[in-house]
Interface confidence: medium
């Protein structure tokens, strides 16, 4: 669908909070992957009954994707070839390059809690160095 993509300001820290904010974002933390391979970025919001209305995925200051409760997924045009939605609210990065190394943020917009932000650091290594076991997979 014709989705107007805004400029993105990456979030940092561990989220904001509503007056009853109890949730926490669980992420994979620091992960590594092979150059040319794929990786799943995954965050999980737990310990809250808040409704998730939207999840943004960003690489530092660039918007990668939006998963909106009403509209579904949108991938930013500049990442369409290498980013796939899911599984779930996660994001799959494909054809990794060394330039993909850096911070990634999941920003959960929830009601009534507010905004929760999770951080993942991805290091893309030459294939002989990457730790295969560091990849995160959804059970």
């Amino acid at each position: 669908y014709p989705y107007d993509v805004p400029d993105y300001a990456g979030g940092g820290g561990s989220g904001g909070g509503g007056s009853m904010m109890t949730g926490t974002i669980e992420t994979t933390g620091n992960i590594s992957a092979e150059k040319g391979g794929s990786i799943i970025l995954q965050c999980h919001l737990s310990s809250t009954t808040a409704q998730v209305t939207q999840v943004n995925w960003a690489q530092q200051d660039q918007l990668l994707a939006i998963c909106n409760a009403d509209l579904g997924w949108h991938i930013s045009p500049s990442f369409k070839d290498r980013v796939a939605p899911g599984p779930g609210l996660g994001l799959t990065l494909q054809s990794l390059t060394v330039n993909d190394t850096g911070e990634y943020f999941c920003i959960y917009h929830t009601y009534p809690d507010g905004t929760y932000t999770g951080r993942i650091f991805l290091e893309v290594l030459e294939s002989s160095v990457a730790e295969h076991g560091a990849r995160f997979q959804i059970p």
């Epitope: 805004p6 904001g16 909106n68 009403d70 507010g114 905004t115």
Partner: antibody
């Protein structure tokens, strides 16, 4: 060019009702959450209500909950605010505003419509 | 609800001056703060969101900083068209709340 045009304001007696409309153009209305924000004469801004792009999420300020109803018709590119049981303190300019796709900041606003509640 | 407190409520400045407006939240809002400019009889205009990101089309003399509870809007060199009222708004949580405004007047 993004345009938001409010209408439906006017003078109403306490306890009365009004329905405000906001006509949107210049963007894909069905992709954006929308807000109503009001401003009493000589005062600051007060958020009133929000509706998500597909109407699945609707939130209200406590001051209007149970009296105001926000709705939208994506086929008509229109946003509405049904205001019932109006009080003098509801007197204000009412603005419709578009929500950014990524955050709950409001990137485009209409010119506003004045609602006066007085006997 | 989160209370947003702006200071000063008004200030007088001259063209070319550096102007700083502060906004304090009653609790942490991470970096999720927006700044708006409003001129008399007009609708507000978004200047900055997410604390420091300039809205498209806004002159670079406007900048925002801060996180947690304390935020600042800076106009590096005040221009004639910048005389207006400025509002902060937290967009971290429901209900979204605004500061009381800062009126920037000509000295």
């Amino acid at each position: 060019e993004v345009q938001l045009v409010e209408s439906g304001g006017g003078l109403v007696q306490p306890g009365g009702s009004l329905r405000l409309s906001c006509a949107a153009s210049g963007f894909t209305f069905s992709n954006f959450g929308m807000h109503w924000v009001r401003q009493a004469p000589g005062k600051g801004l007060e958020w009133v209500a929000f509706i998500s792009s597909g109407s699945s999420s609707i939130y209200y300020a406590d001051t209007v909950k149970g009296r105001f109803t926000i709705s939208r018709d994506n086929a008509k590119n229109s946003l509405y605010l049904q205001m019932n049981s109006l009080r003098a303190e509801d007197t204000a300019v009412y603005y419709c505003a578009r929500m950014r796709l990524d955050y709950y900041a409001m990137d485009y606003w209409g010119q506003g419509t004045m609602v006066t509640v007085s006997s | 609800d989160i209370q947003m407190t702006q200071s000063p409520s008004s200030l007088s400045a001259s063209v070319g001056d550096r102007v700083t407006i502060t906004c304090r939240a009653s609790k942490s809002i991470s970096k999720y703060l927006a700044w708006y400019q409003q001129k008399p009889g007009k609708a507000p205009k978004l200047l900055i969101y997410s604390g420091s990101t300039l809205q498209s089309g806004v002159p670079s003399r406007f900048s925002g900083s801060g996180s947690g509870t304390d935020f600042t809007l800076t106009i590096s060199s005040l221009q004639p068209e910048d005389f207006a009222t400025y509002y902060c708004q937290q967009h971290n949580e429901y209900p979204w709340t605004f500061g009381g405004g800062t009126k920037v007047e000509i000295k």
